[in-house]
C-alpha cells in the first residue's frame, strides 16, 4: 500500500509554512492580517510586556513536565495485588485508636515477591472500599515515614453516597521507596482533613475492613475486599530485554536535530514572521521554532518469517498497530503572541503551535 | 501531493487486525503465542478473576476523565491579568491576622471587565511570587465561600529555596463561579497545612506583597509582582463564532459510529481473539473493541480565494498545520488480559489498545 518517493523537503517546508499562515489567522478568527494603521509609535507598554512574559513563563513551566513515554510503557505490565496485613496483627497495637485516622499496613516481603526491583514498578494504587457515607468528607492520605512520623501524600473530597465505592490513590513513588528500603512492614494512614482553625474533625467515612471503632472485623463485606495495593510492573524476565535491546528513542528535538534519522522524526523549522510570512503585525515574538514531523513509519507484516526480529520493530514503527502508520506530532507547546487590534495591544495564547516530538501513530 | 483512491475497507481492517496480532505479542515480548499444554482445566481461579476485574475497574474509572478538547481550545485565548486588591483595603480588616494564613482579595468587577461571560474563561491561574524559603513548607489554598467560611482547593509542598519563584495555582473553576455570582469582592486564603495531631503550624513562606506580619508593604519587590490572577479567555467578539459556526466535532465513538462521516473518524472494529486471530490462549477477555482511524484530512491551501471559508476548515481538517495531515488516534485506552504462562495465570495490562477518538494531525 505504501509507494516510495523521494521527499521534496523544500515543498514540505513550504506547505508547512503556508499551513501555519492559515492556522494563525484561523486561531485568531481573522480573515486577513489586521490593519496596522492605528498602532502608536514606540515599544510595547511595560504592562503588556510583563503580561506577555507571564504567559511565556507559564509555558516554560509546563512544557518541562510531560516527558515522552519511556520505552517500558509500551510493554505489557503484570498486575498483582497485595492485601493489607490483617488488623489483628500486633503492628496495629502500636498506633493509638483515634477518631480521625485509620491505619493500613503492608508486608514488604509480599511486595518484593510481586516486584523484585523498584525500577520494574510502573504503577501502584492503594484501593479502599468505601462503605456508605452520610456527609461530605475531606480525607488525607499519609505514608509512615519514620517511627511515629507521617508524611502527607494526597487528599480527596468524598461526596455523600448510599452505595459502596472503590477509592484509588496513586502511591507509585511511595511503594518504589519501600521496595528500595529494608523495612518489613510499611503503612498508610487515612485521616480526616483538619484545617488550622477547626481541629475537631472526625473521620466519618467507613472503609471496608475496619469497624467503626477503627479496628478488626474483616468480614464487613468480604476479606478480599479489604484495602489492597494494586501493582503494575514489568516482569523480571522481560526487564532484561529493556536493558539489552536498543531503547525506544524519543523522537524529540534532542535526538532528531542531532541525527541523520531517515524514519519518522521531528524536523527543524524556524518561522520568521516577517521573512517567511511577510507579516509585520505580530509584535512579539519575532518568530518561533514551529518544526514539523517527517519520515516513514513502515507497516510491519507480523506474519513475516523473521518473527522475533519483526516484533522488536513494533515499538518504534507502529506502536498503535495502525493499518497505515503515520508520522505525527506527539508533544506540542503553545505560543503567546502580542499584536494590535486598532490602538489596543493584545496578548493571546495560541495552543499547539510548536512541535517538540513526533511519533508513529 | 494527495492522490484520491477508493479505500478498500476490508484490506484496511485486515491490516489493522494483523498489526494487532504483532502488537500484542510484541507488548508481551513473545515471539509466538504461548503453549497451552500446561493450562489446567476449568475456569480461572477466583483470585485471578478478582484481580482482572480490579484492573478493568481502574481502566473504566480512568477512561471517563480525559474528554476530547473542546472546539474553543483550538482558538487563541486573550491573556489578561487582575492584580490583588491592595492590602490597605478595608476588606482585609475583617480577617484576623494569623500566623498560619495570608488572605488575597480580588475585585470581581475587574474580573468581569476582562471576562464578561463565565463560559468564555478558558483558564485562570493564581500567581504568587514566593520569596526565599528556609524550610520545606506544606501549604493549602482555600477559596472564600460564605461570610467567614473557607473551602479547600489544593495544596503544594514547597521546597526550600534561596531565590524568588513564581507559584501558580489553577483556579479556573473558582473564578468561573465568581463570574457567575453577584459578589463584589472575592478571595483566597493561603494557609500552612495543619494535620490533626500537630496544630502549631506557622506559614513560613513569604509571599511578595505581604510583610512578615502578613500585611501591607507592596513594594517588597515590585507592586506589579503582588499576587494576581492570570486569565485566558475567548474574546467576546470571537465567542459569537463559537455558538454560530458548526462546532468542531469530537471524532469519537459517539459521533462517528452514528454518522456517515467520510472524513477522518474512528471506525468500529471488534477483535474476536478466536475468530480474527485464531488465538485461544487469551482467557479474558474473549475480544475487545480495538477500532481504528480512517478518512481523509484534506490539506487546506490558505492562499485560496475563498479565504474566510477556508480558515473555518482548519480547526477540523488541519488544526496542527501539518504539511500532510493524517487521521490518527487521539484518545486511547488500555486493555487488561489474562493468559497462562505454563501453569501460572497472569493478569497483564496492555497500554494504548483501544481507539476511542481520532484527530487530523
Amino acid at each position: 500500500l505504501s509507494t516510495c518517493k523521494t521527499i521534496d523537503m523544500e515543498l514540505v517546508k513550504r506547505k508547512r509554512i503556508e499551513a501555519i499562515r492559515g492556522q494563525i489567522l484561523s486561531k485568531l478568527r481573522l480573515a486577513s492580517p489586521p490593519s496596522q494603521g492605528e498602532v502608536p509609535p514606540g515599544p510595547l507598554p511595560e504592562a503588556v510586556l510583563a503580561l506577555y512574559n507571564s504567559t511565556r513563563d507559564r509555558v516554560a513551566g509546563e512544557s518541562a513536565e510531560p516527558e515522552p513515554e519511556p520505552e517500558a510503557d509500551y510493554y505489557a505490565k503484570e498486575v498483582t495485588r497485595v492485601l493489607m496485613v490483617e488488623t489483628h496483627n500486633e503492628i496495629y497495637d502500636k498506633f493509638k485508636q483515634s477518631t480521625h485516622s485509620i491505619y493500613m499496613f503492608f508486608n514488604t516481603s509480599e511486595l518484593r515477591e510481586a516486584v523484585p526491583e523498584p525500577v520494574l514498578l510502573s504503577r501502584a494504587e492503594l484501593r479502599l472500599l468505601r462503605l456508605k457515607l452520610k456527609v461530605e468528607q475531606h480525607v488525607e492520605l499519609y505514608q509512615k515515614y519514620s517511627n511515629n512520623s507521617w508524611r502527607y501524600l494526597s487528599n480527596r473530597l468524598l461526596a455523600p453516597s448510599d452505595s459502596p465505592e472503590w477509592l484509588s490513590f496513586d502511591v507509585t513513588g511511595v511503594v518504589r521507596q519501600w521496595l528500595s528500603r529494608g523495612g518489613e512492614i510499611e503503612g498508610f494512614r487515612l485521616s480526616a482533613h483538619c484545617s488550622c482553625d477547626s481541629r475537631d474533625n472526625t473521620l466519618q467515612v467507613d472503609i471496608n475492613g475496619f469497624t467503626t471503632g477503627r479496628r478488626g472485623d474483616l468480614a464487613t463485606i468480604h476479606g478480599m475486599n479489604r484495602p489492597f495495593l494494586l501493582l503494575m510492573a514489568t516482569p523480571l524476565e522481560r526487564a532484561q530485554h529493556l536493558q539489552s535491546s536498543r531503547h525506544r528513542r524519543a523522537l524529540d528535538t534532542n535526538y532528531c536535530f542531532s541525527s541523520t534519522e531517515k524514519n519518522c522524526c521531528v524536523r527543524q523549522l524556524y518561522i520568521d514572521f516577517r521573512k517567511d510570512l511577510g507579516w509585520k503585525w505580530i509584535h512579539e515574538p519575532k518568530g518561533y521554532h514551529a518544526n514539523f514531523c517527517l519520515g516513514p513509519c513502515p507497516y510491519i507484516w507480523s506474519l513475516d518469517t523473521q518473527y522475533s526480529k519483526v516484533l522488536a520493530l513494533y515499538n518504534q514503527h507502529n506502536p498503535g498497530a495502525s493499518a497505515a502508520p503515520c508520522c505525527v506530532p506527539q508533544a506540542l507547546e503553545p505560543l503567546p503572541i502580542v499584536y494590535y487590534v486598532g490602538r489596543k495591544p493584545k496578548v493571546e495564547q495560541l495552543s499547539n503551535m510548536i512541535v517538540r516530538s513526533c511519533k508513529c501513530s | 501531493l494527495s492522490t484520491c483512491k477508493t479505500i478498500d475497507m476490508e484490506l484496511v481492517k485486515r491490516k489493522r487486525i494483523e498489526a494487532i496480532r504483532g502488537q500484542i505479542l510484541s507488548k508481551l515480548r513473545l515471539a509466538s503465542p504461548p503453549s497451552q499444554g500446561e493450562v489446567p482445566p476449568g475456569p480461572l481461579p477466583e483470585a485471578v478473576l478478582a484481580l482482572y476485574n480490579s484492573t478493568r475497574d481502574r481502566v473504566a474509572g480512568e477512561s471517563a476523565e480525559p474528554e476530547p478538547e473542546p472546539e474553543a481550545d483550538y482558538y487563541a485565548k486573550e491573556v489578561t491579568r487582575v492584580l490583588m486588591v491592595e492590602t490597605h483595603n478595608e476588606i482585609y480588616d475583617k480577617f484576623k491576622q494569623s500566623t498560619h494564613s495570608i488572605y488575597m482579595f480580588f475585585n470581581t468587577s475587574e474580573l468581569r471587565e476582562a471576562v464578561p461571560e463565565p463560559v468564555l474563561l478558558s483558564r485562570a491561574e493564581l500567581r504568587l511570587l514566593r520569596l526565599k524559603l528556609k524550610v520545606e513548607q506544606h501549604v493549602e489554598l482555600y477559596q472564600k465561600y460564605s461570610n467567614n467560611s473557607w473551602r479547600y482547593l489544593s495544596n503544594r509542598l514547597l521546597a526550600p529555596s534561596d531565590s524568588p519563584e513564581w507559584l501558580s495555582f489553577d483556579v479556573t473553576g473558582v473564578v468561573r463561579q465568581w463570574l457567575s455570582r453577584g459578589g463584589e469582592i472575592e478571595g483566597f486564603r493561603l494557609s500552612a497545612h495543619c494535620s490533626c495531631d500537630s496544630r502549631d503550624n506557622t506559614l513560613q513562606v513569604d509571599i511578595n506583597g505581604f510583610t512578615t506580619g502578613r500585611r501591607g508593604d507592596l513594594a517588597t519587590i515590585h507592586g506589579m509582582n503582588r499576587p494576581f490572577l492570570l486569565l485566558m479567555a475567548t474574546p467576546l467578539e470571537r465567542a459569537q463564532h463559537l455558538q454560530s459556526s458548526r462546532h468542531r466535532r469530537a471524532l469519537d465513538t459517539n459521533y462517528c459510529f452514528s454518522s456517515t462521516e467520510k472524513n477522518c473518524c474512528v471506525r468500529q472494529l471488534y477483535i474476536d481473539f478466536r475468530k480474527d486471530l485464531g488465538w485461544k490462549w487469551i482467557h479474558e477477555p474473549k475480544g475487545y473493541h480495538a477500532n481504528f482511524c480512517l478518512g481523509p484530512c484534506p490539506y487546506i491551501w490558505s492562499l485560496d480565494t475563498q479565504y474566510s471559508k477556508v480558515l473555518a476548515l482548519y480547526n477540523q481538517h488541519n488544526p496542527g498545520a501539518s504539511a500532510a495531515p493524517c487521521c490518527v488516534p487521539q484518545a486511547l485506552e488500555p486493555l487488561p488480559i489474562v493468559y497462562y504462562v505454563g501453569r501460572k495465570p497472569k493478569v497483564e495490562q496492555l497500554s494504548n489498545m483501544i481507539v476511542r477518538s481520532c484527530k487530523c494531525s
Epitope: - | S35, Q36, G37, E38, V39, P41, G42, P43, H283, G342
Partner: antibody, heavy 121, light 107 residues
C-alpha cells in the same frame, strides 16, 4: 499427517497389568496436554486420565486413581498408560486423545483409533 | 463430581429435520462444555467446544448454545451422514465427565 496411534491392548487376567502406548505425529507433542478416554462395549465415553504438556501435572478419574499411571516421553512423542490391578470393569476400548486446553476448556480435538483391553479370567 | 445428563437418550428423525439435543449439568459449569459425534466402530469427533464455538472443518448446520447448567446441540437440517451418537462433556473441573449419549437414528 497429524495422527495418534494406540498400541499395547490385549487380554489380561484380573489383577494383572498392561501398558498402553500412544505414538503422536504431525504436531508439536510437548505443546499439548494428552488424555486417555475409554468406552466399555455398548456403553458411553468415560474419561480416564490426563497429563500436561511437560508431564508436570497429572489428573485421574476416581475409578482408576492409585491403579493407573499416566506418563509421557516428549523426546519420543509418546504417551503411556500403565494399568495395574486390573478389574473386569476396566474392559473397554482405550482411546488416546489430544487435549486443546486453551482457555481451560479442555476439549479432545484429535483422537486415535483406540485399542481394546479385555480383563477376563 | 459433576454429573452430565443428556436427553433424549435416543431420537428418530428424517433427513432435512431440525434436531435439538439437550445436556444438563448437576451444577453451573459456565460455558465449559463440548460436544462430540461418534459413529459405530469409530473414534469420537469434536463438533463444538466452549458451548458454542464450531470446530474447524465441522459443517455450519451444527450449532451449540447455553451457559450455566443447560446446553443444547442443534442440527439445523439433518443430513444422512449425521446419524450417529452424540456426547456432551464438561471441562469445568476434574474429573472430566461425559453425558450418557444421545443416539440419533433414521426414522
Amino acid at each position: 499427517e497429524v495422527q495418534l496411534l494406540e498400541s499395547g491392548g490385549g487380554l489380561v487376567q484380573p489383577g494383572g497389568s498392561l501398558r498402553l502406548s500412544c505414538a503422536a505425529s504431525g504436531f508439536t507433542f510437548s505443546s499439548y496436554a494428552m488424555s486417555w478416554v475409554r468406552q466399555a462395549p455398548g456403553k458411553g465415553l468415560e474419561w480416564v486420565s490426563a497429563i500436561s504438556g511437560s508431564g508436570g501435572s497429572t489428573y485421574y478419574a476416581d475409578s482408576v486413581k492409585g491403579r493407573f499411571t499416566i506418563s509421557r516421553d516428549n523426546s519420543k512423542n509418546t504417551l503411556y498408560l500403565q494399568m495395574n490391578s486390573l478389574r473386569a470393569e476396566d474392559t473397554a476400548v482405550y482411546y488416546c486423545a489430544r487435549v486443546d486446553s486453551s482457555g481451560g476448556y479442555w476439549y479432545f480435538d484429535l483422537w486415535g483409533r483406540g485399542t481394546l483391553v479385555t480383563v477376563s479370567s | 463430581d459433576i454429573q452430565m445428563t443428556q436427553s433424549p437418550s435416543s431420537l428418530s428423525a428424517s433427513v432435512g429435520d431440525r434436531v435439538t439435543i439437550t445436556c444438563r449439568a448437576s451444577q453451573s459449569i459456565s460455558s465449559y462444555l463440548n460436544w462430540y459425534q461418534q459413529k459405530p466402530g469409530k473414534a469420537p469427533k469434536l463438533l463444538i467446544y466452549a458451548a458454542s464455538s464450531l470446530q474447524s472443518g465441522v459443517p455450519s448446520r451444527f450449532s451449540g448454545s447455553g451457559s450455566g447448567t443447560d446446553f443444547t446441540l442443534t442440527i439445523s437440517s439433518l443430513q444422512p451422514e449425521d446419524f450417529a451418537t452424540y456426547y456432551c462433556q464438561q471441562s469445568y473441573s476434574t474429573p472430566l465427565t461425559f453425558g450418557g449419549g444421545t443416539k440419533l437414528e433414521i426414522k
